[in-house]
Amino acid sequence: HTAAQDNCTCPTNKMTVCSPDGPGGRCQCRALGSGMAVDCSTLTSKCLLLKARMSAPKNARTLVRPSEHALVDNDGLYDPDCDPEGRFKARQCNQTSVCWCVNSVGVRRTDKGDLSLRCDELVRTHHILIDLRHRPTAGAFNHSDLDAELRRLFRERYRLHPKFVAAVHYEQPTIQIELRQNTSQKAAGDVDIGDAAYYFERDIKGESLFQGRGGLDLRVRGEPLQVERTLIYYLDEIPPKFSMKRLTA
């Protein structure tokens, strides 16, 4: 390896191809799958990450009750269409011309239709509830220590502004992290809560997206926090539109 190659990597996204051929020999990294240039000083958008993933080879406090409009990503992986900024396009279609509308985190928010389906705008997911169950420990974690550690994680590892971590709830063995970010609150350069949640989800699953960094080693006062189940609920600024058939199923 040479200095140029060694120094030309994307710390925040290992699913990239980088070469020092930008202006003045700047290191330029492009996302796999889309070939779009990415900013390696911050998180890559979930849409580009999903696209890259699909292109890769196959191998006394009460907990929050998710609202009736909360979405869970039951559809799993798909090869998304991203706009020039790397955001999800409001309408997604598969190879068989089945289409549906998605929110800003790429989760389906309508029934599936055909090519005539219209998705007028990309609806923003403004509230994300990350529901975790940790493995049994000798005793419960101290709530304020747990709160501080998770806030630190989102601030330092995912570069999410602290004001967007609305709350951390804990009732052993369930931990809930609430992320809130309205369109009006998100300034230029702010990490999106959807992207931070996706990086966290991949970290928890032991599939870190960071280049060369070790996996996530979560500890609260030195005690390992090992997650055995994760559920993520997404709340949109406009409630989703599903038929009654789905809602009663």
């Epitope: 040479t2 140029a4 120094n7 070469s19 020092p20 930008g22 020999g25 290191c27």
Partner: antibody, heavy 116, light 107 residues
């Protein structure tokens, strides 16, 4: 150590072409971009274009598009800049420079004089 | 194209003086700015890259600062060998553009 050795001075007639070479040593040629910069007598520096020998990707200053051609010969670790349809205002010292993140190693320069 | 406006175009200073040269970009350049020193009849030499990073082997009296559109090269205590012309370069986007240069002369 990194070295860029350029070809010697040239005197050319208006309308003709010149090809300046830049032989690189001390590093892996295909790993860094080569930029070409010129400097007219008593004037400042002017960027002409950039080539990445690793993929032959190049970018030109619009001002020289169509007149300048950048090439790289990986077998000899040599970059070339050819400028055609020369005019008197092309009289300048032409530099090649290896860049990485804005940090540059420069060749010694090649004086091209265009005169009838 | 991004315009780089360098000032002053020339200055006279004495050995030991603190010298400041500024470069203003016509738009934000994300700190992708470098500084070069050139002596008569010689090729330019890199001093600073990424706005504030000192090139190995360059004396610590040279420093770079600034962000966004406004950048500064400072020579904390001018030495006899520092009399030369200094150029800034933006490499945020193509085409790369240089400032017009600042000639530092002996007072």
């Amino acid at each position: 150590q990194v070295q860029l050795v350029q070809s010697g001075a040239e005197v050319k007639k208006p309308g003709s072409s010149v090809k300046v070479s830049c032989k690189a040593s001390g590093y892996r040629f295909t790993d860094y971009v080569i930029n070409w910069v010129r400097q007219a007598p008593g004037q400042g520096l002017e960027w002409m274009g950039q080539i990445y020998p690793g993929s032959d990707a190049f970018h030109y200053n619009q001002k020289f598009q169509g007149r300048a051609t950048l090439t790289a010969d990986k077998s000899t670790n040599t970059a070339y800049m050819e400028l055609s349809s020369l005019r008197s205002e092309d009289t300048a010292v032409y530099y090649c420079a290896r860049f990485f993140e804005g940090l540059a190693y420069w060749g010694q320069g090649t004086l091209v004089t265009v005169s009838s | 194209d991004i315009q780089m406006t360098q000032s002053p175009s020339s200055l006279s200073a004495s050995v030991g003086d603190r010298v400041t040269i500024t470069c203003k970009a016509s738009q934000g350049i994300n700190n992708y700015l470098s500084w070069y020193q050139q002596k008569p009849g010689k090729a330019p030499k890199s001093l600073i890259y990424r706005a504030n990073r000192l090139v190995d082997g360059v004396p610590s009296r040279f420093s770079g600062s600034g962000s966004g559109t406004d950048f500064t090269l400072t020579i904390s205590s001018l030495q006899p060998e520092d009399f030369a012309t200094y150029y800034c370069l933006q490499y945020d986007e193509f085409p790369l553009t240089f400032g017009g240069g600042t000639k530092v002369e002996i007072k």
